[in-house]
């Protein structure tokens, strides 16, 4: 969902301290959790009702390196006869994700946070009815 | 998706460049796009025929302190009539997203790259048939 | 019924400080972002800051970045907006704006007038 | 940003009469537009979210059409209490811009 914006006091020392030197943090290396995984049904892409196809992009200068964008293969969802059914709607699913940057100029290598749009899948949705008023 | 493992390359410096001192790296301050958020179709998590809640999360010593998790409502699907039908499955489409972890000491501040497991929604797909041998 | 009563406006000098307030009901005011817009004497609508529901999260226009702080106490059901360092060009009626999505503005209060004149 | 252009500025009819307001989108926007609709002395009224459903409470003779870059409001026929201005706005991309308005004055 969300991510905040930065502007505020997340990264900022307290108050009391004296500033961080030239606009830049320490981050300390290696990825608390990194061995964690997505574990999902097999193909659900395909066997979803509001079927997706997967795009990757690559970065060499961001991690991850890999970004993987769904794109909704239907305006409307699969039916149980496998005909699309224009009575209901895919819709992507986004996600508010950080990936890092990485900028070097010879030796000297810095990194920043970015956030991205990732769409994850795709979901079939009932159209907004409308009564008569 | 998948976050690679970051044991390898992408956050040291050349090898012909001085090792990085006290095993951290330089993050400068602010997010680059910060300003973009996620815009989805309104109630999408109510009008899904594999609805789902929302629970959010909230940690100060995070970014994005605030992470909101989804869980499917239903093991079936909701079909046209409104009921549960089983003989279709609700499953979670996870992400995997970076989050910041802060860690301070009095006036030392530092912070460590996190990885997150997010449920960002449900699809509803058709359960995977097992044949008879 | 979802009402939201904007206060704090008023007439002030270049470089001045103005604090506006939105006192919000009818609705679990802490689950929805916040917003609020502007419009000029005689002008269209513009955009200024959002608030999370929890206030985790922050946005502003690039015309209001740096002088302006959006803040919440949910436990008073208000939202405000600091005005700090006010321009001429910050003159506007200032209406605060329920959330039902992203910048999906469904219920909006009658508005606050802020005059920024020497 | 995304510049919203909507057309025509000012829009000249009798009650009963039908009218169509239009609003071009700089990129698209997807169907993540808005329809408002402001009185004198007034605050906005949202009547259409997400270019073509109806708010709660919104007439039926208020429809919305349009997606990506091209969406219009259409009035089927108006009522003495629809002369207003009209405005469109975006969400899809930070930061959510409005039109300029479209005025709908009595001929």
């Known amino acids: 969902r969300k991510i905040p914006k930065v502007g505020h006091t997340f990264f900022q020392k307290p108050e009391s301290c004296p500033p961080v030197p030239g606009g830049s943090m320490k981050l300390d290396i290696g990825i608390i959790n990194e061995n964690q995984r997505v574990s999902m049904s097999r193909n659900i892409e395909s066997r979803s009702t509001s079927p997706w196809n997967y795009t990757v992009t690559w970065d060499p200068n961001r991690y991850p390196s890999e970004v993987v964008q769904a794109q909704c293969r239907n305006l409307g969802c699969i039916n149980a006869q496998g005909k699309e059914d224009i009575s209901m709607n895919s819709v992507p699913i986004q996600q508010e994700t950080l990936v890092v940057r990485r900028k070097h100029q010879g030796c000297s290598v810095s990194f920043q946070l970015e956030k991205v749009l990732v769409t994850v899948g795709c979901t079939c949705v009932t159209p907004v009815i409308h009564h008569v008023q | 998706r998948k976050i690679p493992k970051v044991g390898h390359t992408f956050f040291q410096k050349p090898e012909s460049c001085p090792p990085v001192p006290g095993g951290s790296m330089k993050l400068d301050i602010g997010i680059i796009n910060e300003n973009q958020r996620v815009s989805m179709s309104r109630n999408i998590e109510s009008r899904s025929t594999s609805p789902w809640n929302y629970t959010v999360t909230w940690d100060p010593n995070r970014y994005p302190s605030e992470v909101v998790q989804a869980q499917c409502r239903n093991l079936g699907c909701i079909n046209a009539q409104g009921k549960e039908d089983i003989s279709m499955n609700s499953v979670p489409i996870q992400q995997e997203t970076l989050v910041v972890r802060r860690k301070h000491q009095g006036c030392s501040v530092s912070f460590q790259l996190e990885k997150v497991l997010v449920t960002v929604g449900c699809t509803c797909v058709t359960p995977v048939i097992h044949h008879v041998q | 019924e979802v009402q939201l009563l904007e206060s704090g406006g008023g007439l002030v000098q270049p470089g001045g400080s103005l604090r506006l307030s939105c006192a919000a009901s009818?609705?679990?005011?802490?689950?929805?972002?916040m917003n609020w817009v502007r419009q000029a004497p005689g002008k269209g609508l513009e955009w200024v800051s959002t608030?999370?529901?929890?206030?985790?999260?922050?946005y502003y226009a690039d015309s209001v970045k740096g002088r302006f702080t959006i803040s919440r106490d949910n436990s008073k059901n208000t939202l405000y907006l600091q005005m700090n360092s006010l321009r001429a060009e910050d003159t506007a009626v200032y209406y605060c704006?329920?959330?039902?999505?992203?910048?999906?503005?469904?219920?909006w209060g009658q508005g606050t007038t802020v005059t920024v004149s020497s | 940003e995304i510049v919203l252009t909507q057309s025509p500025a000012t829009l000249s009819l009798s009650p009963g009469e039908r009218a169509t307001l239009s609003c071009r989108a700089s990129q698209s926007v997807s169907s993540f537009l808005a329809w408002f609709q402001q009185k004198p002395g007034q605050a906005p009224r949202l009547l259409i979210y997400?270019?073509?459903n109806r708010a709660t409470g919104i007439p039926a003779r208020f429809s919305g059409s349009g997606s990506g870059t091209d969406f219009t409001l259409t009035i089927s026929s108006l009522e003495p209490e629809d002369f207003a201005v009209y405005y469109c706005?975006?969400?899809?991309?930070?930061?959510?811009?409005f039109g300029q308005g479209t005025k709908v004055e009595i001929k």
């Open positions: 997400d270019a073509s």
């Open positions: 009818g609705f679990t005011f802490s689950s929805y972002a």
């Open positions: 706005q975006q969400r899809s991309n930070w930061p959510p811009t």
């Open positions: 608030i999370s529901g929890r206030g985790g999260s922050i």
């Open positions: 704006a329920k959330e039902e999505a992203t910048w999906d503005f469904d219920y």
